[in-house]
């Protein structure tokens, strides 16, 4: 795993990136687990990095990734309660230069490395699906959500609502 | 809709300090964050310090060790202590929150009105 040094020596100026002339309003660190607390965990293995989901040892320190997040620049076409506020995506990136990407023909999850702008397919659509969980939908295609599936990070579609609190497309992030 | 309503702006001598709120109200089902940003004149809005809802905060280098955010997840509101003030930190404070309603899983971002900071002798 890339552990936390790694990761704190990749302190970036908060305004520092654009992306197709749009910065992200809010970047931090945070580790993420799924909803049975295994942690997604990033390994450098034949030059390419992989994903694990996985328990880790007692004192086993984290990995943390670099949310961070875009308004989007298009209104939401959600009918609601009045809601004025702007969609927001995230991007996720475990280390400087890789962001976490999704890939719709092999419904898999790879970190690429890649210079900005980013592509469409490293934004996800952020959802508080249940208390104190995230999950992240592809910009690219709605209804697909990051999910585990065999101790990976897979994409999932869900089809319908009552399927969006599934618990494998469920994370929770930590500061700590 | 969600509301953002801040307070504590003013006008302060070098050195002083104040301490900005914010109160979200509305139909709030979950805050993912809330943070603060500011805009002096003819410049970009810039993000001042960010707090999630697990605690984590994020301060932008020109603040550091002089800004403290801090949260009360009971009433929905962030605070900014802001101390050793300087002329450069003269702008309008915005508050900003990440939270999705009861209508919609999706999280949205919304935005104050914004608060006022002059710092002159």
């Known amino acids: 795993a890339f552990g936390i040094s790694g990761v704190q020596k990749y302190t970036r100026a908060l305004h520092d990136s654009s992306i197709t002339g749009i910065s992200p309003i809010t970047e931090y660190l945070a580790s993420l687990s799924t909803y049975n607390d295994q942690s997604i965990t990033f390994a450098l293995e034949d030059e390419s990095y992989e994903i694990y989901v996985e328990d880790l040892k007692k004192d086993e320190k984290k990995d943390k990734v670099l949310l961070s997040y875009y308004e989007s620049q298009h209104p939401s076409n959600e009918s609601g309660d009045g809601v004025d506020g702007k969609m927001l995506m995230v991007t996720l990136s475990p280390t400087k230069d890789f962001w976490l990407h999704a890939n719709n023909k092999e419904h898999s999850v790879e970190l690429h490395k890649c210079e900005k702008p980013l592509p469409d397919q490293a934004f996800f659509v952020l959802h508080n699906m249940h208390s104190n969980c995230v999950s992240f939908e592809c910009k690219t295609d709605p209804g697909v959500f990051i999910g585990v599936k065999d101790n990976h990070l897979a994409l999932i579609k869900v089809d319908s609502s009552e399927n969006l609190c599934t618990e494998n497309i469920l994370f929770k992030l930590s500061e700590t | 809709q969600v509301q953002l309503v801040e307070s504590g702006g003013g006008l302060v001598q070098p050195g002083g300090s104040l301490r900005l709120s914010c109160a979200a109200s509305?139909?709030?089902?979950?805050?993912?964050?809330m943070g603060w940003h500011r805009q002096a004149p003819g410049k970009q809005r810039e993000l001042v310090s960010v707090?999630?809802?697990?605690?984590?905060?994020n301060y932008a280098d020109s603040v550091k060790g002089r800004f403290t955010i801090s949260r009360d997840d009971t009433k929905n509101t962030v605070y900014l202590q802001m101390n050793s003030l300087r002329a450069e930190d003269t702008a309008v404070y915005y508050c900003?929150?990440?939270?999705?309603?009861?209508?919609?899983?999706?999280?949205?971002?919304?935005w104050g009105q914004g608060t006022l900071v002059t710092v002159s002798s």
């Open positions: 900003n929150a990440a939270a999705s309603t009861y209508s919609s899983t999706v999280v949205r971002s919304f």
């Open positions: 509305g139909s709030i089902r979950t805050v993912n964050y």
């Open positions: 707090v999630t809802s697990g605690g984590g905060t």
